[in-house]
């Protein structure tokens, strides 16, 4: 029978008695930075090349007894999860191991840096196909480790790391907090976040997705035919490294941004019980469990988008929070969220030649988040059109006036602290979907993009009575690019995209009277690319 | 994920450009920063990654490392260069006393210095 974890990541059409997906990552090389490994284990023999790289600290304790099987246990198991003959994800992938963790599973930031540098030099000396680097380790936040990961990622290497086993915010750990790295949390057979002793998987906005990470059967270093169950975010990261190897083997030209978007797109959505996470982290933590794509080709026609949350701004009056997209992604919309509801909106602005999403805290607010909608849109030309606060009572409006540009997102930002407290809602005039509207005291920002075959439409869902949450989703074949609340509702905490659904959150209904003030409208902008669809059909 | 001004401890030590009469004094107004792990038990004081500015060449990294050793020796401190980085980040790994941090932060080309720390299998 198929181990539960392999069944979980396999789309139904691949499920047979044997887990044998096509082309098991044979064009890809996976580097493993971990403990030493037992390379003659039946599961990985001939698949893993042990490099001569070793940089580990001394083991702690005077009585520590180096037992080979214990020294090799973590690395051997992970190599088996990635590419093992019986229990591996990418059975065709070849691996190279670097020893950066000692027999107690302990290493140093400096040793890891030197290991990453070794990989970069190897890549320059002997360029091969796509490279995946698996970092099944974590330490405290490290600027230098994150910087090294960023450089390696920009050299075209896909880095996958463990979120950490500390039942804590992954942003406090490295390399988990590096934006360029694919950070993986762990779930179990019941799709619950993994508990490990008194702790468990890390969570939060620095996690990209989750993957099976509890009771994972893999190669045991106890003997060359032994298997063992291990658990942790390392095991989860190994699954994603295997999936990445499969995807890259099928489409070797995929960029890191494209790979990350596909991993997110093909994940199982909304299956994790979020109650396990601290309340303030639930909205920030992606409810995604990794899976292989249903087919190796044909995903190219879709418009892929993901949601990126900023760090919390902090509570000071003028505090701001910034969310950024990856270098190859386009910022198609920007929204903001505050648990207290006290915010001064958000705006898209240029920073270092790229658009970023900046959210503004308000006086008395506990802080804000900026939420960027980051999309893959080849040959896109996007710009922001801003309308300053209007004098007229009809409110502020802005639209995309350039020929061929379509509206992908709306943002609004205001200077006054109590915007809209006693103001009636401003309604968008019918038949004018290609414009953003807002309060007359607010400046309105429209994200306008031109890309071959790009078309967008606005979808609204309004609820007259107060509700804590109003949602509107894009239909099949369309991708959510923009998410905002129709202005006029002072109790709106903010808006953000979850997968293909726009969520507008309001204050607790018990504190809000059911006046017209209580009406909430969620506005989604849904886009698709006919050009990508045609290009995909031509390829096939 | 995390911005570079993230949740970690940062100690900023101001530069005194007249110190040691450096031939290649850093540009006016730039401040090299010192970082260390916020989780105390994971800190490894005595080993430091000195990260140099982005376009620094290997030869300049080696020269900066030698300069640190020479200046430390003049003060009676032993230092050991454990590794010179190039290919990913310019810089070097040095074993030295924490007393020398202020001196190291004033070296030319230095962007920031990070104290080494532990990482763990997950």
């Amino acid at each position: 029978s198929i181990p539960w974890n392999l069944e979980r990541i396999t789309p139904p059409r691949y499920r047979a008695d044997e887990y044998q997906p096509p082309d098991g990552g044979s064009l890809v090389e996976v580097y493993l930075l971990d403990t030493s490994i037992q390379s003659d284990h039946r599961e990985i023999e001939g698949r893993v090349m042990v490099t001569d790289f070793e940089n580990v600290p001394e083991e702690d304790g005077t009585r520590f007894h180096r037992q080979a099987s214990k020294c090799d246990s973590h690395g051997t198991h992970l190599a088996g999860v990635v590419s093992g003959r019986d229990a591996g994800v990418a059975k065709g992938a070849s691996m190279r191991s670097l020893r950066v963790l000692n027999c107690q599973g302990k290493g140093t930031v400096s040793g890891t840096l030197i290991g990453l540098e070794f990989i970069r030099k190897s890549q320059l000396v002997q360029p091969v196909g796509p490279l995946v680097v698996l970092l099944p380790l974590a330490g405290g936040y490290s600027r230098v480790l994150n910087a090294a990961c960023q450089r390696l990622a920009r050299a075209g290497v896909v880095l996958v790391t463990a979120a950490g086993n500390f039942r804590d915010d992954a942003c406090l750990y490295s390399p988990a907090s590096a934006p360029e790295v694919i950070t993986v949390g762990a779930t179990n057979a019941q799709d619950q976040p993994v508990t490990l002793g008194t702790l468990g998987t890390n969570f939060g906005r620095c996690v990209d997705l989750f993957a099976p990470g509890e009771d994972i059967i893999g190669a045991s270093s106890d003997c060359s035919t032994c298997f063992v169950s291990q658990s942790g975010t390392s095991q989860a990261a190994a699954h994603v490294a295997g999936i990445a190897a499969m995807m890259l083997s099928a489409e070797p030209e995929l960029t890191l941004a494209e790979l990350r978007q596909r991993l997110i797109h093909f994940s199982a959505k909304d299956v994790i019980n979020e109650a396990w996470f601290p309340e303030d982290q639930r909205v920030l933590t992606p409810n995604l469990v990794a899976a292989l794509p249903p087919s190796t080709h044909g995903a190219g026609w879709q418009l892929f988008c993901r949601t990126v949350w900023s760090a919390h701004s902090g509570p000071t009056r003028m505090a701001t929070a910034v969310a950024r997209c990856a270098p190859d992604e386009e910022l198609l919309s920007c929204s903001s969220f505050s648990r207290s509801g006290k915010r001064r909106g958000e705006r898209m602005e240029a920073q270092g030649g790229k658009l970023v999403c900046r959210a503004h805290n308000a006086f008395g607010g506990e802080g804000v988040y900026a939420i960027a909608r980051c999309c893959l849109l080849p040959q896109a030309n996007c710009s922001v059109h801003t309308a300053p606060p209007a004098e007229a009572s009809m409110g502020t409006r802005v639209h995309c006036h350039q020929q061929g540009h379509v509206l992908t997102g709306c943002s609004s930002h205001w200077e006054v602290e109590d915007l809209g407290t006693h103001k009636p809602p401003v309604l968008r005039p019918r038949g004018q979907p290609n414009q953003c509207v807002g309060h007359r005291e607010a400046s309105i920002h429209a994200s306008c993009c031109h890309a071959p075959g790009l078309e967008c439409k606005v979808k609204e869902h309004g609820i007259p009575a107060p509700q804590e949450q109003v949602t509107v989703a894009c239909e099949e074949g369309w991708t959510l690019t923009g998410c905002s609340a129709l202005p006029g509702t002072s109790h709106v905490l903010g808006a953000y995209a979850v997968d293909n659904t726009c969520v507008v959150r309001s204050r607790d209904v018990s504190t809000t009277g059911s006046t017209s003030e209580g009406a909430v409208t969620a506005v989604a902008i849904c886009c698709r690319s006919r050009h990508l669809a045609q290009a995909s059909q031509e390829l096939q | 994920q995390e911005d570079e001004d993230g949740d970690y401890e940062e100690l900023v030590l101001a530069l005194r450009s007249e110190e040691d009469g450096l031939a290649e004094a850093p540009e006016h107004g730039t401040t090299a920063t010192f970082h260390r792990c916020a989780k105390d038990p994971w800190r490894l004081p005595g080993t430091y990654v000195v990260v140099l500015k982005e376009e620094t060449h290997l030869s300049q990294s080696e020269r900066t490392a030698r300069r640190l050793q020479a200046q430390a020796a003049r003060r009676g401190y032993l230092t050991k260069i454990l590794h010179v980085f190039h290919g990913l980040l310019p810089g070097f790994l040095v074993k030295m006393s924490g007393d020398l941090l202020e001196l190291a932060l004033k070296l030319p080309h230095v962007d920031y210095i990070e104290e080494d720390s532990s990482v763990f299998a997950q």
């Epitope: 599973g105 086993n165 106890d222 658990s231 | -």
Partner: antibody, heavy 130, light 107 residues
Framework: EVQLVESGGGLVQPGGSLRLSCAAS????????MSWVRQAPGKGLEWVAN????????YYVDSVKGRFTISRDIAKNSLYLQMNSLRAEDTAVYYC???????????????????????WGQGTTVTVSS | DIQMTQSPSTLSASVGDRVTITCRAS??????LAWYQQKPGKAPKLLIY???SLESGVPSRFSGSGSGTEFTLTISSLQPDDFATYYC?????????FGQGTKLEIK
């Protein structure tokens, strides 16, 4: 679906020997500790012995130490209990069970997390009587 | 060796009742305790592990609590299928011990 099937039980005289076998299916057999548990007629459950994945560690209840030996054959996916110097009080239904547990790392220590005996055989009866 | 004592030895209850079975360890076992259900002529079935974690496929009416030396198994609303014998098991070390069992019968 993992299945465990015991065999080898029967009637034996006091002082005699018997070898119980437990056949398992799938690679998951070799991935976990395994236990033997017995239940005397009309009585409760009593844990007898367990063995690590590779057979390198074994533990026994005091009452069987020196008389019973637990072993496993990974190639044959089988677990065994060699019972010598049998006594009347060893009369029971003997179950083999999988000890589901997992290893994990946390801040430099290698830990074991045990879930319990999640898969059981149907049992084999051992009667020790003259 | 660690001794496990269950109480009561026998418990009579009706369908729909909320029932609680207690297990006491002779020394602290942290949360390393499991609960099993056994029906006549059948092998035991794992219900709860690590004192309070529900095994996959077990109905949510079963719950466990406690740590150290005092543990309880609760069935929130008894169903006809729940009449059986229940055992606790400690696994603080690699040597395990079971409680003597609690027989849950129809009133």
């Amino acid at each position: 679906e993992v299945q465990l099937v015991e065999s080898g039980g029967g009637l034996v005289q006091p002082g005699g020997s018997l070898r119980l076998s437990c056949a398992a299916s799938g690679i998951t057999f070799s991935s976990y500790w395994m236990s033997w548990v017995r239940q005397a007629p009309g009585k409760g459950l009593e844990w007898v012995a367990n063995i690590k994945q590779d057979g390198s560690e074994k533990y026994y209840v005091d009452s069987v130490k020196g008389r019973f030996t637990i072993s496993r054959d990974i190639a044959k996916n089988s677990l065994y209990l060699q019972m010598n110097s049998l006594r009347a009080e060893d009369t029971a239904v003997y179950y083999c069970a999988r000890d589901r547990g997992t290893y994990y790392f946390q801040s430099g220590s290698y830990n074991y997390y045990y879930y319990g005996m999640d898969v059981w055989g149907q049992g084999t009866t051992v009667t020790v009587s003259s | 060796d660690i001794q496990m004592t269950q109480s009561p030895s026998t418990l009579s209850a009706s369908v729909g009742d909320r029932v609680t079975i207690t297990c006491r360890a002779s020394q602290s076992i942290s949360s390393w305790l499991a609960w099993y259900q056994q029906k006549p002529g059948k092998a035991p079935k794992l219900l709860i592990y690590k004192a309070s974690s529900l095994e996959s496929g077990v109905p949510s009416r079963f719950s466990g609590s406690g740590s150290g030396t005092e543990f309880t198994l609760t069935i929130s609303s008894l169903q006809p299928d729940d009449f059986a014998t229940y055992y606790c098991q400690q696994y603080n070390s690699y040597s395990y011990t079971f409680g003597q069992g609690t027989k849950l019968e129809i009133k």
